[in-house]
Structure formats: C-alpha cells, structure tokens
C-alpha cells in the first residue's frame, strides 16, 4: 500500500466568514520539513506555497484577496515531505458575506427571558432567499439553518444561562454566499441561579479554533524536547 503522511489541519484565520472584497487567510498546518503545501478549492488545485526554510516551520498561510462568491466554497490542503504526500485535510467551508441586503432579527417572547422559557428567533430578509442562518457570537461554527420565503423561525429551549449572548442572522443565497449580518440581538437569561457561576460568558474575540497556530522550530524547542525525552527515560 502507498505510504502517506498524516493529514494536515486547515483553518481560517480569524473567521471562515469573509466579507466580500476583503482578504481571506487560510492556514495549512502540516509538519516540520514539509517542502510544499497545496491548497485545493472544490477539488482542484488553487494555490501552492513553499515554506522557507521548510525544516523550521510547521505550516503556511494562503492569502485569498478580494473575496467573492466564486472563491467561496470548500477548501482542503495537502503537504509534501520529500516525495511523500500527506492525506488530504478535512474540508473547510469558506463563506463570503455582505452580499446584497441586511436581514432583521427578533426574538420571541423577548430578549430578556427566565431560565426554562422557550424562545424563538425570527430572521427576515425581503430579497429572494430561502435559507436563513442563525449564529451565536463566539460560537460561529454552531450554525442553525432554517427555511422560509422571506422569514424563518429558529425555535430554541427551554433556555438556560448557557444560551446567553449575542445572536446574528444571515440570509443565504447558496451555502457559501451570505447576506450582510443582522444587527445583533442580545439574549439575557435570568434565573437558573445554581448554574449561573458555571455559565461561560461569550468571548468577544473570534472563535478559538479560528486562529492559525503555526510555529517556528527554535533551538529552545529542540532543547526542551531533548530534556523531556531524557526525563521520560529517567522516570522509566
């Protein structure tokens, strides 16, 4: 059987939702010593990066300028060490936003509810679209989808303090082309006192998995690795 290297990790830097005409940055994290990284879009080669020097960095960044609907879709990456290629990374969905119009978002019964009540978000957009998306800030991977001619419902609950936070909705013209975001609606959930201290407040920074963690190998890292190996042997 043909030998392959472990698959790399593909990520979007800061966010996978990129406003039109802005630059998207995708990171492909492979391994030290990789001489070439390829970015594939919808199954076809899109870009190539060669790290310099290859043995000192474990990945590359691909910059995609002037984001538009033709560049929105599914990306993956692979890398090569010598003649040996890696498996393909998981697919990353890159979305272009700020297309066409801005939807409006409302929540029933209101933005201030008590723990245990059920809430429904309503997203409305008058221009032709049939799919709507609801996202919670700080949890942008957890996209809820709903369908409707000009508006859609997102039932939720019974709510707990974990549902607290800001929500936005988008209209979607296809899976990868979204409208401008709605104004945020902040959901405040009171009650549920025993769980309040455990409920995380939503981060205002981008989602933690939407950051590129490419590292340069330094002499110190090699020393630490050697020290760790020696310590393990001593423990044995």
């Amino acid at each position: 059987p043909k030998q392959t290297l472990p698959k790399p990790i593909i990520r979007a830097e800061s966010t996978y939702m990129v406003p039109k005409e802005k630059q998207a940055t995708l990171c492909c994290q492979g391994s030290y010593g990789a001489v070439e990284y390829q970015l594939h879009f919808e199954g076809s080669l899109f870009a190539v990066e060669r790290p310099k020097p290859p043995e000192r960095i474990n990945g590359v960044k691909f910059h995609i300028p002037d984001m538009n609907s033709r560049k929105a879709g599914r990306y993956s990456c692979i890398y090569r060490v010598g003649e040996l290629w890696s498996e393909r990374s998981d697919l990353l969905d890159l979305v272009v936003t700020e297309m066409y119009d801005t939807p409006t978002l409302s929540v029933h019964p209101g933005p201030e509810v008590t723990s245990g009540e059920k809430v429904t978000f309503y997203c409305r957009l008058d221009t032709a679209t049939s799919m709507f998306l609801l996202l919670k800030e700080g949890r942008s991977r957890d996209v809820q989808r709903s369908y409707g001619k000009v508006q859609a419902e997102f039932p939720m609950g019974p709510v707990t303090t974990a549902h607290r936070g800001s929500y936005r909705c988008f209209g979607s013209y296809n899976n990868y082309a979204w409208s401008f975001p709605s104004e945020p609606v902040k959901l405040l959930v009171t009650g549920d006192i025993e769980n309040t201290s455990l409920a995380p407040t939503d981060p205002t920074f981008p989602d933690s998995w939407d950051t590129c963690l490419l590292t340069r190998e330094t002499g110190l890292q090699k020393d630490l690795a050697l020290w760790d190996h020696t310590a393990q042997n001593l423990l044995r």
Partner: antibody, heavy 115, light 107 residues
Framework: QVQLQQPGSELVRPGASVKLSCKAS????????MHWVKQRPGQGLEWIGT????????NYDEKFKNKATLTVDTSSSTAYMQLSSLTSEDSAVYYC????????WGQGTLVTVSA | EIQMTQSPSSLSASLGERVSLTCRAS??????LNWLQQEPDGTIKRLIY???SLDSGVPKRFSGSRSGSDYSLTISSLESEDFVDYYC?????????FGGGTKLEIK
C-alpha cells in the same frame, strides 16, 4: 404606564373588510411584539397572529393567514389588523396585547358582521 | 399545535376557600405559560407569567406552579373579586394556544 387603546365597536357588512386599530403608549412601540386575539361571544380565546413593529416580522396561526393582515405605523405607535371577506363567524371581540408574554391587553373591539 | 387542556371548566367555591386550576400541555412548553384573568366586562389581565412569576400589583394569594406537563394556578383564600374567568396560555411555540377557560363561581 402602558396603554393600548382600541375602538369599542365596528359594524360591518358581510363580504366587506375592516381595519382594527390599537394605539400604544407608555413604552417603546418598536421594541415589543404585538399580538392579536379573538374571542367569540361566550367562547374562549384564540390567537390570531403577532407582529414585531421594529422589523415587520409577522407570524400567523395558519387558520387566520387568509383572513387577517397585521401591519404597524411606527410614527403613530399604532398596530392594525385588517380582516377581509367578513362573515358571521368573524363576529367577535378582538384584542391587541403587548409583549411576547402577553403582558398588557387592550379593552377589545367588538366587531359585528351584519347585513 | 400544542393543546392546552384546562380543568375544571367551572368551579363553585366559597369565600376564603383555597382553589387550584390546572392546565395540561400536550407537548413540552418549558416554563412558557401565563395565567390570565377575564372580568365580566371583557377586561383581561395577566396574573402569572413564566409559570410562577407574579405580575406586579397582583395579590400574593395568587401563585403558579408546575409538575411535569401540568401547570396550576392556586388562589389561597378566595375574595369576592376573584369570581371571574381564568385562562392559561402557552407562548412556547406558535400557534400560541389558550386553555378552554375556567369559570369560578361563588357557592
């Protein structure tokens, strides 16, 4: 304090339409849902639909979708419900009620459909 | 559509008596339930929201509670002005639905 003012009564002919009003005061009109509820004489309460004045989002009970149309005029803080193709079945008291939790209620408008 | 089954449909009781009205929800509504009071002239007032929260200005003799899918309104000691109609209302899921009502009559 919150007030919802509705006309006391409306007399309309069968087949005609009527536009009921609900003038709101004492709160920010665009920040709260406005529901409409029907009560036939001697009967219980029935939800018709709701509108969010801040965004014109509407939601109707399926059985009233071709009967009622909800609108608002934010400049006068007034909610409206138009009832079309009226029959004797539409003779009832119609209430507007503010807030997703139906917190405040108007006095109701008695609609009588009669030739 | 969520059905709200309210019982009893009518109830005769005496002044000072403790009474309970019940609504059973056909589906999960969480705590999204109101109790409303309707006077003979048609005036409607909300007494309880979110199952057990008392509206401001409502006497403390009114209370709301829940046991599974059964929701109760209890009046601890009936006063003369309490002999009117009562409705439960679920606002968990549209179409929002009312119980059939309870007519509370003086014995």
């Amino acid at each position: 304090q919150v007030q919802l003012q509705q006309p006391g009564s409306e007399l309309v002919r069968p087949g005609a339409s009527v536009k009921l009003s609900c003038k709101a005061s004492g709160y920010t009109f665009t920040s709260y849902w406005m529901h409409w509820v029907k009560q036939r004489p001697g009967q219980g309460l029935e939800w018709i639909g709701t509108i969010y004045p801040g965004s014109d989002i509407t939601n109707y009970d399926e059985k009233f979708k071709n009967k009622a149309t909800l609108t608002v005029d934010t400049s006068s803080s007034t909610a409206y419900m138009q009832l079309s193709s009226l029959t004797s079945e539409d003779s009832a008291v119609y209430y507007c009620t503010r807030d997703g939790r139906f917190a405040n209620w108007g006095q109701g408008t008695l609609v009588t459909v009669s030739a | 559509e969520i059905q709200m089954t309210q019982s009893p449909s009518s109830l005769s009781a005496s002044l000072g008596e403790r009474v309970s009205l019940t609504c059973r929800a056909s589906q999960d509504i969480g705590s999204s339930l109101n109790w409303l009071q309707q006077e003979p002239d048609g005036t409607i007032k909300r007494l309880i929201y979110a199952t057990s929260s008392l509206d401001s200005g409502v006497p403390k003799r009114f209370s709301g509670s829940r046991s599974g899918s059964d929701y109760s309104l209890t009046i601890s000691s009936l006063e003369s002005e309490d002999f009117v109609d009562y409705y439960c209302l679920q606002y968990a899921s549209s179409p929002y639905t009312f119980g059939g009502g309870t007519k509370l009559e003086i014995k």
